[in-house]
């Protein structure tokens, strides 16, 4: 007799075979907060940007990617203290002289009003009220994200 | 009438409520290769180490972490071409003067026989036969990993 989880595995495998849909995350892991179709983890310790990226990666997640101003505001509403800064997945690409998300896309200049310089070794942090350019070596908190909903036919672009 | 996937979501949620177990990855996504309890994705394009880390992160995965010599050998067996190098999640920490995995642990010197220097801006790559220290700016392929099996009571350490 199979357990419901084992049967589940079979069900999902069969579904995946038909649609290339993978299970995805059906609800947020413990300690992660749901914000719409994402799970967010706000760190309690501090790190430079690169170590923050590595931490999210080892948690099989990404540094926060913000789609638009609306998502920024909703994320900022979860930050309790005005003075605390959190790294997100956006840094300055010197070769392209532009702000670049870690998924390879460039910042739409209307999305975030960044305070501070766009220059080498600059990474983006958010606070309860603002978006700041900081030296990437600055040791602050960070936000990891996991996508919550299973995405139909989600195929990773050829890395 | 619920679909098998919807029922599945309920089953998994009930299970998680009892055990704080989250669904995990029940089988490898399309294009990922299973190696024991991991799913591996071997890139086809090239990137410096830092961009490779970012790519894995946005795929909600980690640059490859290798537990021991046995796992190294099994991973190398999946590499078809002798001349191709792949980044893994290990680089040189200047402050600690040691090789450090991206999950924060240090390399056990017996695990990998590294060819090349342990110095600033050095990152680790693997080929079909060897392990090399390369400048982190070198553009080569990389390997991302996802843990396959659901881990009971997996609680992320307080970041």
């Amino acid at each position: 007799q199979k357990s419901s989880i084992e049967k589940c595995s079979v069900d999902i495998q069969q579904s995946r075979n038909k649609t290339t849909e993978r299970p995805g995350l059906l609800n947020c892991p413990i300690y992660w907060q749901q914000l719409r179709e994402k799970c967010l983890l706000f760190s309690h310790t501090v790190n430079p940007w690169n170590n923050s990226l590595a931490d999210c990666s080892t948690k099989e997640s990404s540094l926060l990617l913000i789609r638009d101003k609306d998502e920024l505001i909703h994320t900022q509403n979860l930050i309790r203290d005005k003075a605390i800064l959190f790294w997100i997945g956006l840094n300055f690409s010197l070769s392209e002289k532009n702000w670049k998300w870690i998924n390879g896309s460039f910042l739409n200049s209307n999305d975030l009003e960044i305070r501070g310089d766009a220059k080498e070794n600059s990474c983006i942090s958010i606070s309860q009220t603002s978006v700041y350019s900081e030296y990437c070596s600055t040791e602050i908190r960070w936000i990891c994200q996991k996508e919550l909903t299973p995405v139909r036919n989600k195929v990773y672009p050829d890395s | 009438q619920k679909s098998s996937i919807e029922k599945c979501s309920v089953d998994i949620q009930q299970s998680r409520n009892k055990t704080t177990e989250r669904p995990g990855l029940l089988n490898c996504p399309i294009y990922w290769q299973q190696l024991r309890e991991k799913c591996l994705l071997f890139s086809h394009t090239v990137n410096p180490w830092n961009n490779s880390l970012a790519d894995c992160s946005t795929k909600e995965s980690s640059l490859l972490l290798i537990r021991d010599k046995d796992e190294l050998i099994h991973t190398q067996n999946l590499i078809r071409d002798k001349a191709i190098l792949f980044w893994i999640g290990l680089n040189f920490s200047l402050s600690e003067k040691n090789w450090k995995w991206i999950n924060g642990s240090f390399l056990n010197s017996n695990d990998l026989e590294i060819r090349g220097d342990a110095k600033e801006n050095s990152c680790i790559s693997i080929s079909q036969t060897s392990v090399y220290s390369e400048y982190c700016s070198t553009e080569i392929r990389w390997i991302c990993q996802k843990e396959l099996t659901p881990v009971r009571n997996k609680v992320y350490p307080d970041s």
Epitope: A83, I84, F86, R115, S137, T138, E139, R141 | -
Partner: antibody, heavy 122, light 108 residues
């Protein structure tokens, strides 16, 4: 109890050296930017130096650059200031201060020690 | 370096008075400003950070405002324990982190 306690102050001749220590307790020391701030008798406050949580980033005020060295030992919850080539104008109460959590290099000092007096005189 | 100019340098006031201290930065510092209170022989105490955020445990009669170059600390109703020297401090991301010259609040 959350506190910072400085020690190591005293009377020293011009050109001499002194090492100040600051013992932290009651909080996770390794998560915080730490600074030294000084106050000459009857004068205002002057920021001297800061060190990041990991110790990787350090800054000094121009007035002490090349003479003072800040360091930390996270395992011992301790902050240090090695002061060399001391001058009369370095005479001050030296405070150890913690920055408000995770504001990065925006250093609001939310916890201060009581200070230790350094007197440089011949 | 960014200079901070506090005014007045001293103020005489009575218990219950409203006291306002200003701090002007030599260049724009957004909201990266703090206010501290220091009593004789004691370490400074953080009152306000991020120009207007009240530090935990600080009475609500203290408030801060301003952004850019002009900032204000207001004590709405002066209490006996508020007689002290007050300092502003700029905390932009590049050192040095300068303090204002201080404002002494004395009993009239």
């Amino acid at each position: 109890q959350v506190q910072l306690v400085e020690s190591g102050g005293g009377l020293v001749k011009p050109g001499g050296s002194l090492r100040l220590s600051c013992a932290a307790s009651g909080f996770t020391f390794s998560d915080y930017y730490m600074s030294w701030i000084r106050q000459a008798p009857g004068k205002g406050l002057e920021w001297v130096s800061y060190i990041s949580p990991s110790g990787a980033t350090i800054y000094y005020a121009d007035s002490v650059k090349g003479r003072f060295t800040i360091s930390r030992d996270n395992a011992k919850n301790s902050l240090y200031l090695q002061m060399n080539s001391l001058r009369a104008e370095d005479t001050a109460v030296y405070y150890c201060a913690r920055s408000l959590m995770s504001t990065g290099t925006h250093l609001y000092f939310d916890l201060w020690g009581r200070g230790t007096l350094v007197t440089v005189s011949s | 370096d960014i200079q901070l100019t506090q005014s007045p340098s001293s103020v005489s006031a009575s218990v219950g008075d409203r006291v306002t201290i200003t701090c002007r930065a030599s260049q724009g510092i957004s909201s990266w400003l703090a206010w501290y209170q220091q009593k004789p022989g004691k370490a400074p105490k953080l009152l306000i950070y991020a120009a207007s955020s009240l530090q935990s445990g600080v009475p609500s009669r203290f408030s801060g405002s301003g952004s850019g170059t002009d900032f204000t600390l207001t004590i709405s109703s002066l209490q006996p324990e508020d007689f002290a020297t007050y300092y502003c401090q700029q905390v932009t991301s590049v050192p040095p982190y300068t303090f204002g010259g201080g404002t002494k609040v004395e009993i009239k």
